[in-house]
């Protein structure tokens, strides 16, 4: 055998080159046939009416032909025939790769609630061979479940991802990424998750700055509530007691002027949205006013007083509510 060919892999729409190579040629007739065994080239002449075939080289040692705008119907065995004695035949297989025509991502719900499991589907249509689909949530790879549907030598792959969403997932992209031999670089599509979650409540003492509350001083607490959708109701209540008469409520702020021991107790900020409600508690303890020491007449003494503020976080395990923060000043 002194007739040689090489298999060709080509992307749909691109150019395939078919080469029939002859070692030790005696100038015998050489021809190239298509998978239907129709003659494409007889020597340097193309009897076939398909003008996508063009002669690149014809000599006693080679018949080289290009096929432009390759389609999937061009796939198959192409035969080189050399009419020596005995005649020789060799075939080259053209494999046509078809990149996915379309990449579609579909999320079951536009908006999900934290803790909910949602279904995300990604479909890569009409590729050859079948596409591999990979899933990412942000930079984290996730595992999906793929189904392949074959139709007329083409493959449509649908990958299903079941995703339990958390509040941290809000605004994070879910990425469907395709791996296919006809695709160079990244072919991907993404959708951003929209996750609704109940408020997170945090109490901040904005006055006094040093954190020690004494009789006669003022107290200002600010309630920060973050949720999705943003909480519309932020309310202050005093646990197990009435709110002091001299307390002033202004939106998320609670002001108590001229603190006295009767103000001691737990102050709760409550916030809610359509997902649920949560609260945070602040435990107020009013200290005695500082005692005044008269200055000495002969010697000067510097006294340094160190005040320690302890913030204790207590988790409230009541069902359906966020763990509350109880800030206790000693």
């Amino acid at each position: 055998q002194n007739l040689f060919t090489k298999d060709v892999t080509v992307i749909e729409g691109e150019v395939a080159t078919i080469s029939c190579q002859v070692n030790k040629s005696d100038d015998s007739v050489i021809q190239l046939l298509n998978p239907n065994r129709q003659t494409i080239y007889f020597r340097d002449f193309r009897p076939l009416k398909d003008s996508r075939f063009q002669l690149l080289n014809f000599s006693s040692s080679e018949l080289k032909v290009s096929l432009t705008n390759v389609s999937i119907s061009d796939e198959g065995r192409y035969f080189c025939q050399l009419y020596t004695d005995p005649p020789q035949e060799s075939y080259t297989t053209i494999t046509v790769l078809v990149p996915p025509r379309n990449l579609m991502i579909d999320i079951q719900k536009d908006t999900a609630v934290e803790g909910e499991e949602i279904e995300v589907n990604c479909t890569a249509m009409a590729s050859k061979p079948a596409t591999t689909i990979r899933w990412f949530k942000g930079n984290t790879e996730l595992k999906g479940k793929s189904e392949v549907e074959e139709w007329s030598d083409m493959y449509t792959v649908t990958s299903q991802l079941m995703l339990k969403v958390h509040k941290e997932d809000d605004g994070v992209p879910v990425i469907c990424q395709v791996e296919h031999p006809a695709v160079t670089g990244n072919l991907q599509t993404q959708r951003y998750l929209e996750v609704q979650y109940k408020p997170q409540v945090h109490i901040q003492m904005t006055y006094p700055l040093q954190g020690l509350t004494r009789e006669g001083d003022a107290l200002e607490l600010t309630c920060e509530a973050i949720g999705k959708p943003q909480p519309v109701m932020v309310t202050w209540v005093r646990v197990d007691d009435e709110m002091p008469q001299h307390a002033v409520l202004s939106g998320p702020n609670l002001f108590i002027n001229n603190l006295n021991k009767t103000d001691n107790g737990t102050y709760r900020c409550e916030a809610s949205n359509i997902v649920g409600k949560a609260h945070s508690d602040y435990m107020l303890y009013v200290y005695d006013p500082p005692t005044t020491i008269p200055p000495p007449t002969t010697t000067t003494t510097t006294t340094t007083t160190t005040t320690t503020t302890i913030l204790t976080i207590i988790t409230d395990s009541r069902a359906g509510e966020e763990g509350s923060i109880r800030a206790v000043d000693h």
């Epitope: 005696d26 100038d27 015998s28 007739v29 046939l33 065994r37 129709q38 003659t39 007889f42 020597r43 002449f45 193309r46 009897p47 076939l48 009416k49 003008s51 006693s60 009419y83 020596t84 004695d85 005995p86 005649p87």
Partner: antibody
Framework: QVQLQQWGAGLLKPSETLSLTCAFY????????WSWIRQPPGKGLEWIGE???????NYNPSLKSRVTISVDTSKNQFSLKLNSVTAADTAVYYC?????????WGRGTLVTVSS | SSELTQDPAVSVALGQTVRITCQGD??????ASWYQQKPGQAPVLVIY???NRPSGIPDRFSGSSSGNTASLTITGAQAEDEADYYC???????????FGGGTMLTVL
């Protein structure tokens, strides 16, 4: 000059064997197919068959049972034998070079079959 | 019966354009070749492939193809173009040669 020269008996009796030879003068005998074509008087062209230098043949299915085409590469010659001739085989017989199309023809030999 | 079909006779006025056609299933895949034959002479190739003329053939001869029909067009026919014209191709397998029945062209 590239040419085809043909010769053979011009008068045959029915049931005899027609025998014609064609010689190619030029380069690349091995690079082509070599055909025989005939034309009955006042009628159209009819392809008989073809051969290449290695002896591979293709024949007209309607004549295949009676036809033999052979080749002698040492002389750049090919020959036609047609058995059991009848008056219907009376025709001008042409040899031709084939590159799929027939780009070179012999001058033709009139073969008459008559008792 | 031929696998390629031609009109038996066509006439054209001197200097006018004439088209000779050839029909057959194999022409869906393959180009036809065209031959001119004058009385007492061997055929001469005038057109082959998509529209190729051998050297020495005037450029008034041209070929075209559509579907299962091949055409030979003579633009500005001359008196010396009066002859029989044969189309030829191979069958779909490529193994057997077929000729049309021939068209007699008369130049008036």
């Amino acid at each position: 000059q590239v040419q085809l020269q043909q010769w053979g008996a011009g008068l045959l009796k029915p049931s005899e064997t027609l025998s014609l030879t064609c010689a190619f003068y030029g380069e690349s005998f091995s690079g082509y197919y070599w055909s025989w074509i005939r034309q009955p008087p006042g009628k159209g062209l009819e392809w008989i068959g073809e051969i290449n230098h290695s002896g591979s043949t293709n024949y007209n299915p309607s004549l295949k049972s009676r036809v033999t085409i052979s080749v002698d590469t040492s002389k750049n010659q090919f020959s036609l034998k047609l058995n059991s001739v009848t008056a219907a085989d009376t025709a001008v017989y042409y040899c031709a070079r084939s590159s799929w199309y027939f780009d070179l023809w012999g001058r033709g030999t009139l073969v008459t079959v008559s008792s | 019966s031929s696998e390629l079909t031609q009109d038996p006779a066509v006439s054209v006025a001197l200097g006018q354009t004439v088209r000779i056609t050839c029909q057959g299933d194999s022409l869906r895949s393959y180009y036809a070749s065209w031959y001119q034959q004058k009385p007492g002479q061997a055929p001469v190739l005038v057109i082959y492939g998509k529209n190729n003329r051998p050297s020495g053939i005037p450029d008034r001869f041209s070929g075209s193809s559509s579907g299962n029909t091949a055409s030979l067009t003579i633009t500005g026919a001359q008196a010396e173009d009066e002859a029989d014209y044969y189309c030829n191709s191979r069958d779909s397998s490529g193994n057997h040669v077929v000729f049309g029945g021939g068209t007699m062209l008369t130049v008036l």
